[in-house]
Amino acid sequence: RTTTCFGDGCQNTASRCKNGGTWDGLKCQCPNLYYGELCEEVVSSIDIGPPETISAQMELTVTVTSVKFTEELKNHSSQEFQEFKQTFTEQMNIVYSGIPEYVGVNITKLRLGSVVVEHDVLLRTKYTPEYKTVLDNATEVVKEKITKVTTQQIMINDICSDMMCFNTTGTQVQNITVTQYDPEEDCRKMAKEYGDYFVVEYRDQKPYCISPCEPGFSVSKNCNLGKCQMSLSGPQCLCVTTETHWYSGETCNQGTQKSLVYGHHHHHH
């Protein structure tokens, strides 16, 4: 957020940029949380996303029986490992086709026991407030599909007639990790020392990180003719003085007519 300054007073302004603002020769360049000519004002809303997509990672182990383990498979840069990776990836792409959240697989380790394949199944979905349910459902379908294929594609008389065959009992799901998106936490962090006063409100399923100084939300503070300003002690109304009135009170809702006050003073004297 920037405010441009013209004229002789600019040099003074330069040394007075507040709250970590930096002078660029024309204006104070303010950090995310501040704005104003001197970066003296606290913003009333902070952009917290959300991210476009949310990811999940399932740690799985399957046992491939149609390939015999060789030492070369331990080396991830060997031709053998690369070929195994290619075939395994193709096989898993077939297994998980039909799962829109499926992105791919990543082999982490191959070890002896026919070939025990430790790998991650990667899932991704567009962010909606229901992303957890979407990814939970996808992980269940992954479990169903891998269980089915490792039960059906098995060796018969030491020969496999499929791209890969598996040991039915060698399939395990070790761990499921979903990227956590917590708008409340993000809001609190980004608001820094003002974190106690910023809240998340939703509009059209999108989270907004706002202080009570942001108008149009249920938490918005009504300062009437005054101006809402954030300080370390919370939002406060700065009341205005017009030609005819002084305003006061917590929400600047108490107006005192100047003429009455002056009239009273004249009467006093």
Partner: nanobody, 123 residues
């Protein structure tokens, strides 16, 4: 880069014999799996036989006792000796290879392929 070149096909009478060869270049001859597949007109490609680096062999039921697969690691070559040929053996024969020790007759498991050689069994 692995390259496979199949040869030895031709026209033969029922009951006759043929020997197919496959020359492999860029393939580590003492490792992996080499195989023969065939595709008859209008049919899917099917596994005929494969041989592993340790000499372990496997055959399709339809060719057991008639066909013999072998490999010469020194020459980086694969062979298929076909005896007692039948009309139903008529097909294009392909050699295939994998760097892995495979136990599968599924074509999708083999990344390296030679061009086919035609075998016709007819009187």
């Amino acid at each position: 880069d692995v390259q496979l070149q199949a040869s030895g096909g031709g026209l033969v009478q029922p009951g006759g014999s043929l020997r197919l060869s496959c020359a492999a270049s860029g393939f580590p001859s003492s490792r992996g799996t080499m195989a023969w597949f065939r595709q008859a007109p209008g049919k899917e490609r099917e596994g005929v036989a494969f041989i592993n680096s340790d000499g372990r062999t496997s055959y399709a039921e339809s060719v057991k006792g008639r066909f013999t697969i072998s490999r010469d690691n020194a020459l980086s070559s694969l062979y298929l000796q076909m005896n007692s040929l039948r009309a139903e053996d008529t097909a294009v024969y392909y050699c295939a290879a994998s760097l892995l020790y495979l136990m599968t007759v599924n074509a999708a498991a083999y990344p390296y392929w030679g061009q086919g050689t035609m075998v016709t069994v007819s009187s």
